[in-house]
Interface confidence: low
């Protein structure tokens, strides 16, 4: 008898008008439920109205949800990206600030006459870190030559050295090695450490990028209505006390968050290789040491050469000629006291290890973050029941909810009872992340072993050459393919192919 | 092949405001820094504006600094820029260029052009 | 600033050379690309692009080198088409942004 089924629909007043929605379309009484769309068609208390009102909210509702998970690990992936960061820029400014404040002194004129020099070589070094299109070899490579030209012509100011004689000392300096090892030394080191550090902080980066980019992928029409029927139907149905079941909860959003879910492995990947990178922090080539005590090798480069200077100007002139005597310059240079050299290795200020350990702790946290997401919405945002399986909302009724809980996944959702997905229709922004997540997971493999990843030219023809030596097996198992760097978030800049060992320069 | 097409040229007013618009095909449009070049009657080409590949990073020529402003949507594969307060020496042939890679900053954009529009006539009088 | 110089003539087949220059004594490790504009009004082509790299529809008569802070476009066996104004690009460290320098007009 309609009569006796005819409750009153106080409750799912309350809990629509809580919702800012308009009590006049709220029935007084059950009616009859034929025009309901997404909940079953018993009586209820909803109107067709009503019912498309908190769908739309339901949906808006774990969109919210959604983007407050995403934005928490955006955060804190954002935090420690901008601690690496000034860490980083620190040491290099630490350093270029003890030049500045050491070298006059230490080297008068050979120093201040070329003090631009070294600030642009600081510059570039920024650059270089930040993401530039340098190639730090070249980029050394061109300062010690100017170097070598301006002190050359400033140790002999009684000769006259014209363009072409320059140009053959130029030539020549390969050979004469006329800063020692410093430069060597200098160019391994900065490419192993400005790889590693830029690498992992843009690691960060394209972590954070993804994040945001999934967060941002709307949820389709199926989502929505599973959703609704979890949340809301109940209330509609004369039974709003009964939360959904726990094992309901997960279906439905395991098939919402499917494409999402698709990110594990690769997003796993990311953090293993970024976790791996920071062993590459510590030593006499880490990035402390290095990226601090840039100064203590141009030091050492200039007292090489005022070392060899004699020796040096023989074997020019044996190679290039007897250069003309300048008869205004003045006699040659006296020969300079030596600048004092700061202790190579730096001691560790103990930041470093502090930003590593935590970084580590907290990627590790975050490593099942995708697959875990069903799971943790569901029990953070969902208001699941606590009470026995027979009295929780199944989608249906209150009772017991009788399908078994879907895999992780797309390809997993194809039997899944609560929302239809296509698994054959991945989502494109996903795939592309996966994509952005495989190419920086890449990159920090190859900076493990020290190189800068050899990108594509702009033909886009796929082409490009393999890393150098020296592979961990448990990096080269799961290498992968790296010619695909033309699709790439704002993070993943294309660098210059640089190879760091000695010889071997791929550009 | 790529193909950039450039419109919203014409005669304009001193003291108003350019919209141009660069419609890009035929390469991944998002993973590219592009920019706009200009060229006066009779001159040479000046640098107008770059921007990096997500947007996130811009130069502009000093003639048109704190009167323009570029902008790209990648979705749509379009660059855009905007020129207040025209002067008659705004008039000439804006290109939009695409850069054949960048890093955020796009401090070299003028030397790694690869690809030029046909370019948009723009007369202020 | 980039200075080029204003004019360069040749030959065909002869070998051309057309430098570009930038200002300050040093320049860091800058890009330099080289542009060609065959009349005023037409859009320019690039022929060289980060120092020496060359478009795959361009010829390889056409080449690139920098020593310093000075760029070279190469044209070796110039060719009555090579006729045309040549601008190159960089960085202008100043304004923090893109310059070209004022044009070579090349004459065969």
């Known amino acids: 008898d309609p009569a006796s089924k005819s409750r009153s629909c106080g409750e799912v007043r309350q809990i629509y008008g809580a919702k800012g929605f308009s009590l006049s379309d709220v029935p007084q009484a059950e009616i009859s439920g034929e025009h309901l769309r997404i909940c079953p068609q018993g009586y209820t208390c909803c109107t067709s109205e009503m019912e498309e009102n908190l769908a739309n909210r339901s949906h808006a509702e774990l969109e919210t949800a959604l983007r407050d998970s995403s934005r928490v690990l955006q955060a804190m992936l954002a935090t420690q990206l901008r601690s690496f960061d000034d860490h980083f820029q620190h040491l290099l400014n630490d350093s270029e600030r003890t030049l500045q404040a050491t070298f006059p002194g230490a080297f008068g004129e050979l120093y201040t006459q070329n003090a631009r020099a070294f600030r642009d070589l600081y510059s570039e070094l920024r650059l270089y870190y930040r993401g530039a299109n340098l190639h730090l070899e070249e980029t050394l490579a061109e300062f010690w030559a100017r170097l070598l030209e301006r002190l050359f012509k400033q140790l002999h100011p009684q000769l006259l050295l014209p363009d072409d004689y320059l140009d053959c000392l130029g030539k020549q300096a390969e050979a004469l090695r006329p800063f020692g090892e410093a430069p060597r030394e200098l160019r391994l080191r900065a490419t192993r450490a400005f790889v590693a550090a830029r690498s992992f902080v843009q690691g960060l980066g394209v972590a954070s990028d993804v994040v945001r980019k999934v967060a941002q992928v709307p949820l389709g029409p199926e989502c929505s209505r599973a959703v609704m029927k979890l949340v809301y139907c109940a209330h509609c149905l004369g039974v709003p006390g009964a939360r959904p079941c726990p094992d309901y909860c997960r279906n439905v959003l395991k098939g919402c968050l499917a494409n999402q879910a698709d990110l594990d492995a690769e997003w796993r990947n990311l953090l293993d290789s970024m976790v791996l990178i920071t062993d590459k922090f510590w030593g006499t080539s880490g990035v402390e040491s290095v990226i601090g005590s840039v100064h203590t090798w141009l030091a050492e480069a200039i007292n090489a050469l005022q070392d060899n200077r004699d020796t040096l100007t023989a074997k020019v002139i044996q190679g290039c000629g007897n250069p003309k005597v300048n008869p205004q310059g003045p006699g040659p240079e006296e020969k300079r006291r030596r600048g004092k050299l700061a202790p190579r290795e730096r001691p560790p200020s103990g930041t470093l290890e502090k930003l590593v350990s935590e970084a580590k702790a907290q990627l590790r946290d975050v490593q099942d973050f995708w697959i875990s997401l069903p799971g943790t919405l569901c029990s953070e945002k969902m208001a699941l029941s606590t009470a026995s399986d027979d009295r929780c909302w199944n989608g249906m009724a209150r009772g017991r909810y009788l399908p078994e809980v879907m895999g992780d996944g797309l390809a997993n959702q194809i039997n899944n009872p609560e929302v239809e997905v296509d698994i054959t229709k991945p989502d494109m922004t996903i795939r592309q992340q996966i994509m952005q997540l495989k190419i920086m997971t890449n990159r920090l493999r190859s900076a493990y072993n020290g190189n800068d990843v050899d990108f594509q030219d702009a033909s886009d023809d796929g082409s490009g050459s393999g890393s150098g030596d020296g592979c961990l097996d448990d990096l080269c198992s799961r290498k992968v393919s790296r010619k695909s760097s033309s699709s790439r978030t704002p993070l993943t800049h294309a660098l210059p192919g640089l190879s760091e060992q000695e010889g071997q320069k791929t550009s | 092949a790529v193909t950039l097409d450039e419109s919203g040229g014409g005669l304009q007013t001193p003291g108003g405001a350019l919209s141009l618009v660069c419609k890009a095909s035929g390469f991944t449009y998002s993973s590219y820094a592009m920019g706009w070049v200009r060229q006066a009657p009779g001159k040479g080409l000046e640098f107008v504006a770059s921007i990096s590949s997500d947007g996130s990073d811009t130069a502009y020529g000093s003639a048109v600094k704190g009167r323009a402003t570029i902008s790209r949507d990648n979705r749509q594969s379009t660059l855009r820029l905007q020129l207040n307060n025209l002067r008659a020496e705004d008039t000439g042939t804006y290109y939009c260029a695409k850069s054949y890679r960048c890093s955020w900053n796009c401090w070299d954009y003028a030397a790694k052009i690869d690809a030029w529009g046909h370019g948009t006539e723009v007369t202020v009088s | 600033a980039l200075t080029q110089p204003a004019s360069v003539s040749a030959n065909p087949g002869e070998t051309v050379k057309i430098t570009c220059s930038g200002s300050?004594?040093?320049?860091?490790?800058?890009?330099y690309g080289w542009y060609q504009q065959k009349s005023p009004g037409s859009a320019p082509v690039t022929v060289i692009?980060?120092?020496?790299k060359r478009p795959s529809d361009i010829p390889s008569r056409f080449s690139g080198s920098t020593s310093g802070s000075t760029a070279t476009l190469t044209i070796t066996g110039v060719q009555a088409e090579d006729e045309a104004v040549y601008f190159c690009g960089s960085y202008d460290r100043s304004s923090d942004s893109g310059i070209f320098g004022a044009g070579t007009t090349l004459t065969v």
């Open positions: 300050g004594s040093y320049t860091g490790s800058y890009y």
């Open positions: 692009y980060n120092n020496n």
